[in-house]
Amino acid sequence: RADPCAARPCAHGGRCYAHFSGLVCACAPGYMGARCEFPVHPDGASALPAAPPGLRPGDPQR
C-alpha cells in the first residue's frame, strides 16, 4: 500500500504520521482537530487561508 501520508491529509502544516490504527496528525501551533482543521482561537476567522482554485489532489509531497 502506498504511503498514506503522501496525500498530505493534515491541514495547516500539520505533520502526518502512519499509525497502527490509521494516521495521526501532529498539528502546527495554533491548530487543532483530527486533521488540524480548526484554529485554536475561536475568533481567528482569518487564520484559515483561502482555498486554492479547484478541488483536486495535489502532488505527493509532504
Epitope: 498514506p4 503522501a6 496525500a7 498530505r8 491529509p9 493534515c10 491541514a11 495547516h12 502544516g13 490504527s21 490509521g22 494516521l23 495521526v24 487543532m32 482537530g33 483530527a34 486533521r35 488540524c36 482543521e37 480548526f38 484554529p39 475561536p42 475568533d43 476567522a45 487564520a47 484559515l48 487561508p49 483561502a50 482555498a51 486554492p52 478541488l55 483536486r56 489532489p57 495535489g58 502532488d59
Partner: antibody, heavy 124, light 113 residues
C-alpha cells in the same frame, strides 16, 4: 469514475433494525471521508455522521444518541450504516456522500460526490 | 450544536434576474460553508465549498461570500434550469465533544418565472 452506491433500504417495522451498505469506487480514502445524510419525504437534508477511514474515526450528530452506527470495510471499499430502534420519523432517503476533508494539505469539508440514495420506510 | 438558519424559505424571480440566499450560523464556522443545489428526485449537487470556491463545472453565475457566521449565495442571470432547492452546509468544531460536525440549513426553494 468516483462513485458511491447505496443499497439495503426497504420496509421495516417500528422498533426494527436495518443495515445499509455503500459501495465506494474511484478514490482513495486518505483524502476523503464518507458521510451519511438523510432526507425525509418533502423535507430538508439532515446530517447523520461520517467516518474518516484513514484515521479510523467516526463522528455523529448529537441527535443520533447511539441508535445508528457507521462502520467500514476498507479492503472491500464498503461502508455501512446500522439503523436500530427505528420509528416512523426515520422514514427517509439515506444518502452516502463523499466528503473532501483535507486535500493536499488544504481543508475543504465539502460533500462533493453523492450516491443516488436508498429509501427506508418504517411502517407497520 | 451549530444551527444553520437559511432565509428566505422560498424566493421567486424572473429569468435573467438575480436571487440572494442568506445563511446564518449560530457560531463561528470560519470559511467552512458549502452550498448545494437539489432538484426533485435527484441527490444534491455541490455548488460551492469553502465559502466562495466553485465546484468543478459550476458556472460563474453562482457566487458565494461571507465569513464567520454570515454567508450569502447569489445567483445572477437566472436560467430556468436554476429552479431548485438550495441548501447551505457548515462544518464546525463541537466544543462539547471536541470533534468536527456538519449541519445543514433548512433550504431555500428558488422559483424561476
Amino acid at each position: 469514475q468516483e462513485q458511491l452506491v447505496e443499497s439495503g433500504g426497504g420496509l421495516v417495522q417500528p422498533g426494527g433494525s436495518l443495515k445499509l451498505s455503500c459501495k465506494v469506487s474511484g478514490f482513495d480514502f486518505s483524502n476523503y471521508g464518507v458521510s451519511w445524510v438523510r432526507q425525509a419525504p418533502g423535507k430538508g437534508l439532515e446530517w447523520i455522521g461520517y467516518i474518516d477511514p484513514a484515521f479510523g474515526r467516526t463522528y455523529y450528530a448529537s441527535w443520533v444518541n447511539g441508535r445508528f452506527t457507521i462502520s467500514s470495510h476498507n479492503a472491500q471499499n464498503t461502508l455501512y450504516l446500522q439503523l436500530n430502534s427505528l420509528t416512523a420519523a426515520d422514514t427517509a432517503t439515506y444518502f452516502c456522500v463523499r466528503v473532501a476533508l483535507v486535500v493536499a494539505g488544504v481543508a475543504y469539508y465539502g460533500m462533493d460526490v453523492w450516491g443516488p440514495g436508498t429509501l427506508v420506510t418504517v411502517s407497520s | 450544536d451549530v444551527v444553520m438558519t437559511q432565509t428566505p424559505a422560498s424566493v421567486e424571480a424572473a429569468v435573467g434576474g438575480t436571487v440572494t440566499i442568506n445563511c446564518q450560523a449560530s457560531q463561528n464556522i470560519y470559511s467552512y460553508l458549502s452550498w448545494y443545489q437539489q432538484k426533485p428526485g435527484q441527490p444534491p449537487k455541490l455548488l460551492i465549498y469553502r465559502t466562495s470556491t466553485l465546484a468543478s463545472g459550476v458556472p460563474s453565475r453562482f457566487k458565494g461570500s461571507g465569513s464567520g457566521t454570515q454567508f450569502t449565495l447569489t445567483i445572477s442571470d437566472l436560467e430556468c434550469a436554476d429552479a431548485a432547492t438550495y441548501y447551505c452546509q457548515s462544518y464546525y468544531y463541537s466544543s462539547g465533544s471536541s470533534y468536527g460536525a456538519f449541519a445543514f440549513g433548512g433550504g431555500t426553494e428558488v422559483v424561476v418565472k
